[in-house]
């Protein structure tokens, strides 16, 4: 082979604000976080603090009641789903602080960001189960008296969790770490390797099963429940219904941006300006969805204060009052301290 000095003319001026440029040294890259990322970090911090403490408290309160109170079983499972998701937040927080660098490895990349989707599916399936329960209490009170028990409630929860895990698998499988050449950075994200159809399919399934179908069915469900409740002019407390409606509403509100951006990105080219804009908002949308993981304990406390007039009781007893209300006089053949209604009123209980 010929041996000669290979030289190339040096560069003139470059006005390219680039991180990988022909004349940009390695250490000359930007260290400022984008505004959406800063907002996401603030939300993550708040959600983590409120979510871990709030859901831990809900778990503690409802765990003791779950053997005999069906409402406690529902709220316990919701709290566990939220608590689990909150555990991933310190890692997600750290990654955003490091400009989305992911030093935690491939396994963590597959598992931790998938927890919020597991939470989404678990939450909506549990909310659907709770809503079905509320519906049956209103429209099939005799059936509820005979068959509505803790055992059946736990089976329903187990089915919800199983389905949630199944629905999370696609997102889990397509999550990969991508190592960028310059600046040296490892990114954790989804990779459908060219297959836009598969990416769209996953996004559509997520939108339909995790948002649109539940939104439609739960809206119909609560319309019927509320109509029946108002027509009967129920005199007993409707606090569980109010709490459940608030939880359901918050679910859809906080998941909306994530779902909208997700479906849009699946139909856009990765190099298109709209895609790149939405990608910048991704962390913010995820953090907004994460508010679901801390909002329930807040709803319970607000509801408790509303029902109590003002916060006279300790937080655990206030939560216990909201979360373990009996919907049918004899649940699991036992009375609880919150059962004060007469048999005549019980059929109107929602």
């Amino acid at each position: 082979m010929d041996s000669f000095n290979y030289t190339t003319p040096d560069y003139g001026h470059y006005d390219d604000k680039d991180t990988l440029d022909l004349n940009t040294p390695v250490d000359k890259t930007s260290n400022t976080l984008r505004v959406p990322d800063i907002l996401a970090l603030v939300i993550f911090a708040v959600v983590f603090l409120v979510g871990v403490l709030g859901n831990a408290l809900v778990v503690w309160v409802t765990a003791f009641e779950a053997k005999r109170t069906i409402n406690a079983i529902w709220f316990l499972n919701l709290a566990v789903a939220d608590f689990l998701s909150c555990l991933a937040l310190p890692i997600l927080f750290t990654s955003i602080v490091q400009h989305h660098h992911w030093p935690f490895g491939g396994a963590a990349c597959s598992i931790l960001p998938s927890l919020i989707l597991l939470n989404m599916y678990a939450s909506i399936l549990l909310l659907a189960t709770i809503s079905a329960d509320r519906f049956l209490l209103v429209f099939k009170p005799i059936w509820c008296q005979n068959f509505r028990g803790a055992g059946l409630a736990w089976i329903a929860c187990a089915v919800a969790w199983g389905l949630a895990l199944l629905l999370t698998i696609p997102s889990f499988l397509y999550r990969v770490v991508r190592e960028e050449y310059f600046p040296p950075k490892v990114l954790c994200g989804v990779d459908y390797s060219h297959d836009k159809r598969r990416e769209r399919a996953v996004a559509i399934v997520r939108l339909v099963l995790g948002f649109l179908w539940p939104l439609l069915t739960l809206t119909i469900c609560y319309t019927f429940i509320l109509l029946r409740t108002w027509s009967r002019r129920a005199t007993r407390s409707t606090k569980t219904l109010k709490v459940v409606v608030a939880v359901v509403a918050s679910f859809f509100i906080f998941w909306l941006p994530y779902q909208v951006t997700g479906i849009m990105m699946s139909f856009l080219e990765p190099s298109s300006p709209t895609f790149l804009l939405l990608k910048k908002l991704d962390s913010l949308c995820v953090s907004f969805a994460y508010i679901n993981c801390c909002i329930n304990p807040i709803i319970y406390v607000v509801a408790g204060q509303g029902f109590q007039g003002r916060l006279r009781k300790s937080l655990p007893s206030l939560l216990r009052n909201v979360l373990t209300e009996e919907s049918v006089v004899r649940e699991s053949k036992s009375f609880t301290r919150s059962t004060v209604d007469t048999m005549a009123q019980k059929t109107q209980a929602v």
């Epitope: 990988l20 390695v26 960028e180 390797s193 990765p270």
Partner: antibody, heavy 116, light 112 residues
């Protein structure tokens, strides 16, 4: 003017090691990666890895992790690549190039021939 | 690893013809900085590769304007508007978005 001057051709026996050099001039040595690329006869280019002189960090292509060792001598602005346990498949031209971006500046290449 | 698929492997042309080389990557080359690090090199016999186009469409200094690059995401093209004798050689596409940096198999531009 950016220049990368590589050491001359090497004829080695299977199982031996070889160390080639790449003398850099014309820019701040510690500001950019030094990347190494392999080209077997009549074949495409394969990226071996880079060495970042500023912090001593190296990144290897998984394929070459146990084959190549990258080092630098900052005082002489020279990069080195040592190839271990050579086999006939290691016979190729090895280029050094300035990295941290598209490979705009290349050395002339070092031909390594592995022969019994 | 990102696989770079170049077509055609051989491109016979006459001087003055237009030439087009395609390069497809196995995954998106959009970097987190929003840039796409897809480059084109020309290697003549017995020489080192030389940079022609960087970041999809930017001509390197000294490269004639008959060379142009285009594309986005995973599909890229190098065009030579009027082939000259000095353009003959092997053209490689390469990505430096992800580790490891990878190259296409090469397209040999030769006279008919």
């Amino acid at each position: 003017q950016v220049q990368l001057q590589q050491s001359g051709p090497e004829l080695v026996k299977p199982g031996d090691s070889v160390k080639m050099s790449c003398k850099v001039s014309g820019y701040t040595f510690t500001d950019y990666y030094i990347d190494w690329v392999k080209q077997s006869h009549g074949k495409s280019l394969e990226w071996i890895g880079y060495f970042y002189p500023n912090n001593g960090g190296a990144k290897y292509n998984q394929k070459f992790k146990s084959k190549a060792a990258l080092t630098v001598d900052k005082s002489s602005t020279t990069a080195y690549m040592e190839l271990h346990s050579l086999t006939f498949e290691d016979s190729a031209v090895y280029y050094c190039t300035r990295g941290s971006g598209p490979f705009a500046y290349w050395g002339q290449g070092t031909l390594v021939t592995v022969s019994a | 690893d990102v696989v770079m698929t170049q077509t055609p492997l051989s491109l016979p042309v006459s001087l003055g013809d237009q030439a087009s080389i395609s390069c497809r990557s196995s995954q998106s080359l959009v970097h987190s900085s929003e840039n796409t690090y897809l480059h084109w090199y020309l290697q003549k016999p017995g020489q080192s590769p030389k940079l022609l186009i960087y970041k999809v469409s930017n001509r390197f200094s000294g490269v004639p304007d008959r060379f142009s690059g285009s594309g986005s995401g995973t599909d890229f093209t190098l065009k030579i508007s009027r082939v000259e004798a000095e353009d003959l050689g092997v053209y490689f596409c390469s990505q430096s978005t992800l580790v490891p940096v990878t190259f296409g198999a090469g397209t040999k531009l030769e006279l008919k």
